[in-house]
Amino acid sequence: RLSSKSVNAQVTDINSKGLELRKTVTTVETQNLEGLHHDGQFCHKPCPPGERKARDCTVNGDEPDCVPCQEGKEYTDKAHFSSKCRRCRLCDEGHGLEVEINCTRTQNTKCRCKPNFFCNSTVCEHCDPCTKCEHGIIKECTLTSNTKCKEEGSRSN
């Protein structure tokens, strides 16, 4: 067992918008981070994925219960010490997106392009409508590439 000494470690604090805030915290246990002290609070045990602390931990070391995140609205995908779950992503129709995999308590929503929309970047925050061809199609639109159109006056073989 490692000796108890104060060390700095990066620990994830999770806020209610579904976004992580990185804080440098001091831990008493160097091996497994079982004790966590930050913002004047002391947590002994993290909550598992899909749950959050029922309330903030207090200095006197009492251990709040872990309660589930709101199914379909919030999630946490790793063990953490926060009293807040992460907010599920919305797949915004106006950005050409739809839900591919629904949010669960332990996994954020996965979005994809709506039918007849495409996105050619690795991370898709916005999908564009597929081009409609006036003079015929060379290649159909896919989730990752736009339609390729024939030019006016070009012949089909």
Epitope: N15, K17, G18, L19, E20, L21, K73, R89, E93, G94
Partner: antibody, heavy 121, light 111 residues
Framework: QVQLVQSGAEVKKPGASVKVSCKAS????????MQWVKQAPGQRLEWMGE????????NYNQKFKGKATLTVDTSASTAYMELSSLRSEDTAVYYC??????????????WGEGTLVTVSS | DIVLTQSPGTLSLSPGERATLSCKAS??????????MNWYQQKPGQAPRLLIY???NLESGIPDRFSGSGSGTDFTLTIHPVEEEDAATYYC?????????FGQGTRLEIK
Amino acid sequence: QVQLVQSGAEVKKPGASVKVSCKASGYTFTSYWMQWVKQAPGQRLEWMGEIDPSDSYTNYNQKFKGKATLTVDTSASTAYMELSSLRSEDTAVYYCARNRDYSNNWYFDVWGEGTLVTVSS
Amino acid sequence: DIVLTQSPGTLSLSPGERATLSCKASQSVDYDGDSYMNWYQQKPGQAPRLLIYAASNLESGIPDRFSGSGSGTDFTLTIHPVEEEDAATYYCQQSNEDPRTFGQGTRLEIK
């Protein structure tokens, strides 16, 4: 086009309640969360809370819990915000706004014209 | 709560000049390389109007005289060239953490 039309100005006595409506048109009402924002005279805008019209799930700013109640009537594409136990500090313009999500950044792209609520004895 | 402080309080410029509006957050509003900052314009007696979302994305229908930049705790809205119709109050707003908060506003006057 996308539009949010709010109910008219209200004058209320302290202790009373008021219900402000926000009728949406030009888009699928249940596809976008609705936000509510307060603007008191000479104060910065304050986010009050939000509602998901698809299932009436609500999320409030802690400051407005117990003060504001958000509801929707999906058949009428209308969101409501009720303020209870009115006090002079509730005098403000209240806005509804449509929520958008750009990779978990939530923003308000269309706003109602605002409803002035005046609390006066 | 995350506090947003805007400066200057009032800016007075002539048409054609460059307006630089600042918004500083009390803690970072970034996550995973993205900045959760939005900008709105409000004219007297009107509702706010979205200009910029996610720090630098121009809302559809907004002239490209408007641009947003910044990350972490420091953000800027730039208007160039300024036009008479830009006279308004401009608000920044963060959505990195609940409660979502707004700055106190910068008033832009056109000489």
